[in-house]
Amino acid sequence: MMTGTIETTGNISAEKGGSIILQCHLSSTTAQVTQVNWEQQDQLLAICNADLGWHISPSFKDRVAPGPGLGLTLQSLTVNDTGEYFCIYHTYPDGTYTGRIFLEVLESSVAEHGARFQIP
């Protein structure tokens, strides 16, 4: 039985040209995390494997940095980075847990870095 829950940074906003940390945390389970996949709308960004370490997709390697921890740092943000991001936790013996983060990249300085925002 899967008892764990994924906590994420939720909805976040950041300024164009800036950077943001995507963070998920698995709690309420003793399952072993074997791998975390970071995805953006049907595209692989990066993988962190317990044995193999990090793999960053070639098309993102200039703008994506591993960490902190199992999180992912996106750099040199553009408005095209706006959208849904998913952390997929592969665990043993529970199976797979998925967390969702929505990132909005804003043109001006109205972004609240790393803070939740409300859509009017």
């Epitope: 494997n49 193999l52 997709s57």
Partner: antibody, heavy 118, light 107 residues
């Protein structure tokens, strides 16, 4: 340099058994999931079985479930495929392959031919 | 099981041609799609993984695109060493499944 070397293929009668081995070198064997993929003469590729790095999880194609057993000995850097109750349709070149991150296969062995015939 | 359908099954092309091979999955597989090249008597070789990532050491004339159910392998300018059979493969779920292959022959 990553190397995967299969052995154990040969001619066997229907209903017989065979054990394939794959000796791995050039990487930390226990960190990688491994698979067996086969190719019948003149045909396409068919996935047969996979095993996690620790050996704790195994997976099989329906066509071999209950007849084939995948295993590994991480102390010997070796992958195995025990094949029982062999059928003519099991005739193929069997490749052992490395699966980093469980998303793709990045290295393949040269293959070993298994022929099931009376 | 997820079925992978490749088209065409074979094609004839000349050196320098742009070649496109398509692969369709019977259900959405996100980005879990890989492309391999195989020459007669040899093991397959990874070209593209995760739909669009170029494997290290593979020439940049090879590219992959798509997500969900429809994927494409493109060879921008066919070279003599590219005449081979190409397979797509999904790794979204077990059993892992391959397309039937596309044989690229010399025109």
């Amino acid at each position: 340099e990553v190397q995967l070397l299969e052995s154990g293929g040969g001619l066997v009668q229907p209903g017989g058994s065979l054990r394939l081995s794959c000796a791995a070198s050039g990487f930390t064997f226990s960190s990688y999931a491994m698979s067996w993929v086969r190719q019948a003469p003149g045909k396409g590729l068919e996935w047969v079985s996979a095993i996690s790095g620790s050996g704790g999880s195994t997976y099989y194609a329906d066509s071999v479930k209950g007849r084939f057993t995948i295993s590994r000995d991480n102390s010997k850097n070796t992958l195995y495929l025990q094949m029982n109750s062999l059928r003519a349709e099991d005739t193929a070149v069997y490749y052992c392959a490395r699966e980093p991150y469980g998303v793709w296969i990045d290295y393949w062995g040269q293959g070993t031919l298994v022929t099931v015939s009376s | 099981d997820i079925q992978m359908t490749q088209s065409p099954s074979s094609l004839s092309a000349s050196v320098g041609d742009r070649v496109t091979i398509t692969c369709r999955a019977s259900q959405s597989i996100s980005y879990y799609l890989n492309w391999y090249q195989q020459k007669p008597g040899k093991a397959p070789k990874l070209l593209i993984y995760a739909a669009s990532s170029l494997q290290s050491g593979v020439p940049s004339r090879f590219s992959g695109s798509g997500s969900g159910t429809d994927f494409t392998l493109t060879i921008s300018s066919l070279q003599p060493e590219d005449f081979a059979t190409y397979y797509c493969q999904q790794s979204y779920s077990t059993p892992l499944t391959f397309g039937g292959g596309t044989k690229v022959e010399i025109k």
